[in-house]
Amino acid sequence: EEELQMIQPEKLLLVTVGKTATLHCTVTSLLPVGPVLWFRGVGPGRELIYNQKEGHFPRVTTVSDLTKRNNMDFSIRISSITPADVGTYYCVKFRKGSPENVEFKSGPGTEMALGAKPSAPVVLGPAARTTPEHTVSFTCESHGFSPRDITLKWFKNGNELSDFQTNVDPTGQSVAYSIRSTARVVLDPWDVRSQVICEVAHVTLQGDPLRGTANLSEAIRVPPTLEVTQQPMRVGNQVNVTCQVRKFYPQSLQLTWSENGNVCQRETASTLTENKDGTYNWTSWFLVNISDQRDDVVLTCQVKHDGQLAVSKRLALEVTVHQKDQSSDATP
């Protein structure tokens, strides 16, 4: 005859307040004859949780029909869990006796603990923008979870980050815990469209991690490159000079032209285009009048980007004698 085993498969059961907890218990034999009862705790002060034969247990239901002759499943469900329900639950087999039943065998017990989901991770980036090739730090915080075991990963786009430091507080016992992690990442010139992602995995999330994101567009400043060129073609007595401001971010930009050191107030034509990496190009055209009296014209394109120090590029205008002749010929 097979010896009776009481099987409680879960050593630990995490439950959330207000939900229903299922405590599993199966037996390997129908013998000896007698009931299976559920208790919380051990020893003389243990609390009766469920007895099929007597008592009223409004929050407890059985998973199987215990009245069935060959039933070997004595699992129960406890509804509307509260913090007062935590503890270790035992299913215990009694042998039928007279005048009263005698305890025969106990299961190993299932510890019911309150699990709390972590809050959605919040990712914060640096307070000020930084240029490519510099290191920036991002912090990720999530709160209110239990138990303490938690996994946090960092990604830049799809690639994991490896330079981070993570702390879970408090270190001792607590009803809820918080995690804070700081990741360091070097900015690439194309990071305007990049994202930093903090991913938190916890037993209460059933394999569906929570994610918090930060856009690197808020942390990066890509300084512009400037190029000033003189167009070979001219219109009447005017020469077209172009200032190309390339690959900058953010969009905030002020451009001024000056002629021989004097700032020009007149309107100039310009276009703004967005590159596929999220940076911008700005092209400004400046028309310079050519006359016999103007031998050495120095044009300066000055750009102030995102509140930084102004950068400028100069161009000494090349006006050939031939061009001057043409211009005087064309003048009525």
Partner: antibody, heavy 124, light 113 residues
Framework: QVQLVQSGAEVKKPGASVKVSCKAS????????MHWVRQAPGQGLEWMGW????????GYAQKFQGRVTMTRDTSTSTVYMELSSLRSEDTAVYYC?????????????????WGQGTLVTVSS | DIVMTQSPDSLAVSLGERATINCKSS????????????LAWYQQKPGQPPKLLIY???TRESGVPDRFSGSGSGTDFTLTISSLQAEDVAVYYC?????????FGQGTKVEIK
């Protein structure tokens, strides 16, 4: 030249653990990520996880989470990969492989060079 | 996870002839902001560890003969051996490093016809 030398073959029983070592030479050990990749007999390559030898941080493929532990000893430029609760399906050649530079913080996942491999056989 | 599928599974080519191996990913490996494809190719000879041939889909690792070339973008990639040599008999793997977990193709075995 850059070299990764791994520990010798191991035979383990189901349920046991195995710890494979990988000693690096020819470069600054803490400057590059280290990865572990395994290959079951006659099968393809399977990435297991990474380690940052500078910080000691690790990241594991979901499949191995909870069973794999990667550690390092910077004094000997050695990384270790421990796999627990072994089963017959874990019989494979385990490779360490150097990844990208640590300095940028991002794990660039091409691998060069590779260790010679360590055969782990799980059998009762 | 990104799934990498190679074709064919095996390939028999005459010495001096061209060998072409294809690799398809379940999602694009092109990061448009830097115009790079996050794909590598490896060669593995019997009893040896894999050896890096190509990274960024088309950049040849130093010391790799120029008969090996990588091409393709997005989800479709090709490794070409322009003139097969006896020492090229091996299994070739593609691998994505666009996002973790980093995954490999199932491998293509190249033999001499």
């Amino acid at each position: 030249q850059v070299q990764l030398v791994q520990s010798g073959a191991e035979v383990k029983k189901p349920g046991a653990s195995v710890k494979v070592s990988c000693k690096a030479s020819g470069y600054t050990f803490t400057s590059y990520h280290m990865h572990w990749v395994r290959q079951a007999p006659g099968q393809g390559l399977e990435w297991m996880g990474w380690m940052n030898p500078n910080s000691g941080n690790t990241g594991y493929a979901q499949k191995f989470q909870g069973r794999v532990t990667m550690t390092r000893d910077t004094s000997t430029s050695t990384v270790y990969m421990e796999l627990s609760s072994l089963r017959s399906e874990d019989t494979a050649v385990y490779y360490c492989a150097r990844g990208g530079r640590v300095v940028r913080g991002v794990i660039k996942g091409w691998f060069d060079p590779w260790g010679q491999g360590t055969l782990v056989t799980v059998s009762s | 996870d990104i799934v990498m599928t190679q074709s064919p599974d095996s390939l028999a080519v005459s010495l001096g002839e061209r060998a072409t191996i294809n690799c398809k990913s379940s999602q694009s490996l092109l990061y448009t902001s830097n115009d790079r494809n996050y794909l590598a190719w490896y060669q593995q000879k019997p009893g040896q560890p894999p050896k890096l041939l190509i990274y960024w889909a088309s950049t040849r690792e130093s010391g790799v003969p120029d008969r090996f070339s990588g091409s393709g973008s997005g989800t479709d990639f090709t490794l070409t051996i322009s003139s097969l040599q006896a020492e090229d008999v091996a299994v070739y793997y593609c691998q994505q490093y666009y996002s973790s977990p980093y995954t490999f193709g199932q491998g293509t075995k190249v033999e001499i016809k």
